[in-house]
Interface confidence: medium
């Protein structure tokens, strides 16, 4: 069976939207009005992995682009990147672990924990117009909580 996917946008808990900046980078900033069209639409695929009531494994691709968020070690540090894939082979049910995030729902907010690097989360800075990154702390200055907005296909 084909992998189940839905289209959505994400905003952090400060209501910053995610936009592309350069070919392989996401940034978080406040958008209003027509500028909202700039925000990235994700194709969230429900993939194989450890699952529970509040934890669902997903892959986050960019809609109509052959790019997926992935987690890799760079200089011994878990790092978030946008990785180019062969569109003929993705998405798939059994995604490589670096592409998998545990979507965790807490108090109507979502966290995205790296399956490859437990306790590392998709994060944004308090500051405007800074890169989206993989952070190793929750509850600190960096933001790890998001809301999801469904987008019709």
């Amino acid at each position: 069976a084909p992998v189940r996917s839905l289209n959505c946008t994400l905003r952090d808990s400060q209501q910053k939207s995610l936009v592309m900046s350069g070919p392989y980078e996401l940034k978080a900033l406040h958008l209003q009005g027509q500028d909202m069209e700039q925000q990235v639409v994700f194709s969230m695929s429900f993939v194989q992995g450890e699952e529970s009531n509040d934890k669902i494994p997903v892959a986050l691709g960019l809609k109509e682009k052959n790019l997926y968020l992935s987690c890799v070690l760079k200089d011994d540090k878990p790092t978030l990147q946008l990785e180019s894939v062969d569109p003929k082979n993705y998405p798939k049910k059994k995604m490589e672990k670096r592409f998998v995030f545990n979507k965790i729902e807490i108090n109507n907010k979502l966290e995205f924990e790296s399956a490859q690097f437990p306790n590392w989360y998709i994060s944004t800075s308090q500051a405007e117009n800074m890169p989206v990154f993989l952070g190793g702390t929750k509850g600190g200055q960096d933001i790890t909580d998001f809301t999801m907005q469904f987008v019709s296909s």
């Epitope: 890799v72 760079k74 200089d75 011994d76 540090k77 790092t79 990147q81 890169p131 990154f133």
Partner: antibody, heavy 121, light 108 residues
Framework: QVQLVESGGGLVKPGGSLRLSCAAS????????MSWIRQAPGKGLEWVSY????????YYADSVKGRFTISRDNAKNSLYLQMNSLRAEDTAVYYC???????????????WGRGTLVTVS | SYELTQPPSVSVSPGQTARITCSGD??????AYWYQHKSGQAPVLVIY???KRPSGIPERFSGSSSGTMATLTISGAQVEDEADYYC???????????FGGGTKLTVL
């Protein structure tokens, strides 16, 4: 004001010696690892040497190993590069650079001086 | 020996987006750093760890990395951005520190 100022450059004959100095100000020098980087005329940048904040660990580029000696005096907020057996190919502007350290692989250079010119001829 | 490859020159008009690339076999597992160097001045760190911008660096500077390619992007390049730009990283062992050959950015 946070800055690094190099001095000691000049003209020297092949086989000669020179000692470069770098004076740091505006930050806690003893907290930082430091490096020397050089740029030959019309060429790119080349990392030369690196010293830990305590001076206990030192690295050199292969091109200068055995000829150059890096040292520091934290009490004087100063970094040094003793250059011996100089060759024509050592002709370059030499920069000292502050080197933040957050793990074995995380060296980079976040503050540079304007450099001092060494000419071997 | 390990090499980082940059284009020798990039030209843009003021207000346009300038992209400078840096390719190296170890970049999938090693961070890229970018330096701006104006003649007679101290080099300035403009991007560290692929995409982080030091305080005081204008927002128009951004960095990204994918696979063996790192990219420095200057959105809305200004005349004062004319300079040589160098990428910096290490080989896969982390033992050899290397600068790219440099890219001369012309904003005319």
């Amino acid at each position: 004001q946070v800055q690094l100022v190099e001095s000691g450059g000049g003209l020297v004959k092949p086989g000669g010696s020179l000692r470069l100095s770098c004076a740091a100000s505006g930050f806690t020098f003893s907290d930082y690892y430091m490096s020397w980087i050089r740029q030959a005329p019309g060429k790119g940048l080349e990392w030369v040497s690196y010293i830990r904040s305590s001076g206990s660990t030192i690295y050199y580029a292969d091109s200068v190993k055995g000829r150059f000696t890096i040292s520091r005096d934290n009490a004087k907020n100063s970094l040094y590069l003793q250059m011996n057996s100089l060759r024509a190919e050592d002709t370059a502007v030499y920069y000292c650079a502050r080197t933040p350290y957050s793990g074995r692989y995380h060296w980079y250079f976040d503050l540079w001086g304007r450099g001092t010119l060494v000419t071997v001829s | 020996s390990y090499e980082l490859t940059q284009p020798p020159s990039v030209s843009v008009s003021p207000g346009q987006t300038a992209r400078i690339t840096c390719s190296g076999d170890a970049l999938p597992i090693k961070y890229a750093y970018w330096y701006q160097h104006k003649s007679g001045q101290a080099p300035v760190l403009v991007i560290y760890e692929d995409s982080k911008r030091p305080s005081g660096i204008p927002e128009r500077f951004s960095g990204s990395s994918s696979g063996t390619m790192a990219t420095l992007t200057i959105s809305g390049a200004q005349v004062e951005d004319e300079a040589d730009y160098y990428c910096y990283s290490t080989d896969s062992s982390g033992n050899h520190r290397v600068f790219g050959g440099g890219t001369k950015l012309t904003v005319l």
